[in-house]
Structure formats: C-alpha cells, structure tokens
Interface confidence: low
C-alpha cells in the first residue's frame, strides 16, 4: 500500500492525531489536502517545521496562502522563522523576523 492509499484509509481518524504521527506521515508521501490539515489539532500542528508541513501537504502546500489568517495555519506561521516560510515561495507573512531569539516556551512552562 503506497502513502496515498494509506492516507485515504486513515484520513477520517486524523483530526486528533498527535505531532509525532504527523511527523511520521510527512515522510510517507501522503499529500494531505487542506481541508484535512485545517481540522488538525492546533497544538499538534505547531511543532511541525516548514519542511515537515511542506512534505505533509505535498502539492497542496500552495493552499496555505489562502488559509494564512485561519487556525491552525495562522498560529503555525507565528511560530516559524520568516526565512523558513520564505522558502515556500507563497508570500506567507507573520513569521519570526531574522535575528530574533526563539524561546522554547513549552520548556519554560514545564519549569514554572
């Protein structure tokens, strides 16, 4: 079973998928459609890198531009370096400016 066939089978269960499952899927050439991506848990999407989202969506990555003001895309963009977002060539704006320090807030919260 190839990545696309596997994706069709598990598509209906993806809404609550954790980050690790999404990272694994991104390695399987599944080309997740935007409608499915938009239903994912925001907290599961946030840790994904630009490269992982690009692999996860495949040819559908271009649709991020249309959804840049909506969750979870909006929140995900805010967590990415602008430099990395620029590599997609989609004109996505709102990432962390170059030279800014990125703090791991989840670690900070765990310690407080």
């Amino acid at each position: 079973m190839n990545g696309s066939e596997y994706f069709v089978k598990i598509q209906s269960f993806l809404g609550g998928a954790p980050t690790e499952d999404l990272k694994a899927l991104s390695q399987q050439n599944v080309s997740m459609d935007l409608a499915t991506f938009m239903k994912l848990r925001t907290d599961a999407v946030l840790p994904l890198t630009v490269a992982e989202v690009q692999k996860l969506l495949g040819p559908h990555v271009e649709g991020l531009k249309a959804e840049e003001r909506h969750r979870p895309v909006r929140d995900w963009i805010l967590r990415q370096r602008q430099d990395d977002l620029d590599t997609l060539g989609l004109g996505l704006q709102g990432g962390i400016p170059n030279g800014y320090l990125v703090l791991d807030l989840s670690m900070q919260e765990a310690l407080s």
Epitope: L34, G63, K65, A66
Partner: antibody, heavy 120, light 107 residues
Framework: QVQLQQPGTELVKPGASVKLSCKAS????????MHWVKQRPGQGLEWIGN????????NYNEKFKNKATLTVDKSSSTADMQLNSLTSEDSAVYYC?????????????WGQGTLVTVSG | DIVMTQSQKFMSTSVGDRVSVTCKAS??????IAWYQQKPGQSPKALIY???YRYSGVPDRFTGSGSGTDFTLTITNVQSEDLAEYFC?????????FGGGTKVEIK
C-alpha cells in the same frame, strides 16, 4: 464548463493606463486563484501575478510590481488587471488563467487573451 | 527566480515519428512542472501536470517524465495537428516561470 471571457483587443497611447478584464463562469469564482500571464509577439510566457478572489490577497512577480495591479469583483465574478505607464514593451497578449486554491498552479484553463497595442 | 531552459528552439519531425522536448530547471523543482501546447493564434493548452500526469482529454501519445531539474515531454506517433510550440512551466515556487518554448515542425 469553465469559461473565461476577455476582450479581444485594447489600443492605448504611451504613458496611459489600461484595465483588462477577465469574466469567469462555470466554477466557484472564490475557490480559484486568478493568474495573469504576458506573451509578447513571437516570444515566451511571463507570469505577472495572481489574486485570491476570496480575500483579495495577491502575489506579484517582482518585475511587474510597479506595472500591474490585480483586483477582483466577486459580485460579477470578474478579475481585473490594471497596467500603468504603458510603453511599447507592454504591447503583448495578456491571458488570465485560474487554478484551484488548494493545489499547486498548473493552468488547465486559459482565457482567449487580450491583445494590448501601445501606439502613439 | 528559477530559470527554465528549453535549449532547442526548433525541432523537426515527421508524421508517425517520436520527438522529445527537453526542459531544464536552474534548481530542484521536484515534479512541480507542467507542459503546455500553443498553436499559432491560440491560447496555450495544458497537456501535463506534476511532470507526468496527463490532463483529461489529452491523447496518450503525449508523455511527461523527469524530476528534480531535468524534464522531458515525449510525443510518440506524431500527428500533423501536433505542429505547435511547447512550453514547460515550474510551479514549485513564486514567481512561476516558463521555458522559452520549443517549436515542433512537421517535415
């Protein structure tokens, strides 16, 4: 059936502006980006930019940023491109071409094109 | 910007023959490539997307192949109506860019 109506020709004077229209039918207008492509006589194709009819967001080829302005009128399912400060270099056929917002932009449909002639 | 190079501006072939039009990208574009056919006085017509998938209604004598930087459009059993100019286009990143075109002439 997807249809894209463009005027056949526009004759304009150097230094003037022109607004080209592309009236779409046969699909959900707000679900498709509208792209614009330039072709000078006997030459290749150049991508000018695209506009998202659902929110007016746009992307431009840097080369055309000060030349073209892309807008849409959702009520009439029409995309417009205004070209300003026209010179002979702008004499070309201009095509509109939509593509579905959730996929990468290969152009399955093209308008017939508008021939713009800049002549004094 | 990604530069798409179609090194052959003209290609001559005969009806029934096979012809291959090539296109080279200046950087890796995966399979984010489309091919178009344009006949004199007409709009471009989409033939191939994602490097190798035919649009519906396109005859199966048109085949696309390649990935990364090197791509080929092959026409087998060339017909007289295939007389046209062929363009490749990358849609891996903005700005979208096209090759300069290859004119296929029938002997």
């Amino acid at each position: 059936q997807v249809q894209l109506q463009q005027p056949g020709t526009e004759l304009v004077k150097p230094g003037a502006s022109v607004k080209l229209s592309c009236k779409a039918s046969g699909y959900t207008f707000t679900s498709y980006w509208m792209h614009w492509v330039k072709q000078r006589p006997g030459q290749g194709l150049e991508w000018i930019g695209n506009v998202n009819p659902s929110n007016g967001g746009s992307n431009y080829n840097e080369k055309f940023k000060n030349k073209a302005t892309l807008t849409v009128d959702k009520s009439s399912s029409t995309a417009d491109m205004q070209l300003n400060s026209l010179t002979s270099e702008d004499s070309a056929v201009y095509y509109c071409a939509p593509h579905y917002i959730g996929s990468r932009p290969g152009f399955a449909y093209w308008g017939q094109g508008t021939l713009v002639t800049v002549s004094g | 910007d990604i530069v798409m190079t179609q090194s052959q501006k003209f290609m001559s072939t005969s009806v029934g023959d096979r012809v291959s039009v090539t296109c080279k990208a200046s950087q890796n574009v995966g399979t984010n490539i489309a091919w178009y056919q344009q006949k004199p006085g007409q709009s471009p017509k989409a033939l191939i997307y994602s490097a190798s998938y035919r649009y519906s209604g396109v005859p199966d004598r048109f085949t696309g192949s390649g990935s990364g930087t090197d791509f080929t459009l092959t026409i087998t059993n060339v017909q007289s109506e295939d007389l046209a100019e062929y363009f490749c286009q990358q849609y891996n990143s903005y700005p979208l860019t096209f090759g300069g075109g290859t004119k296929v002439e029938i002997k």
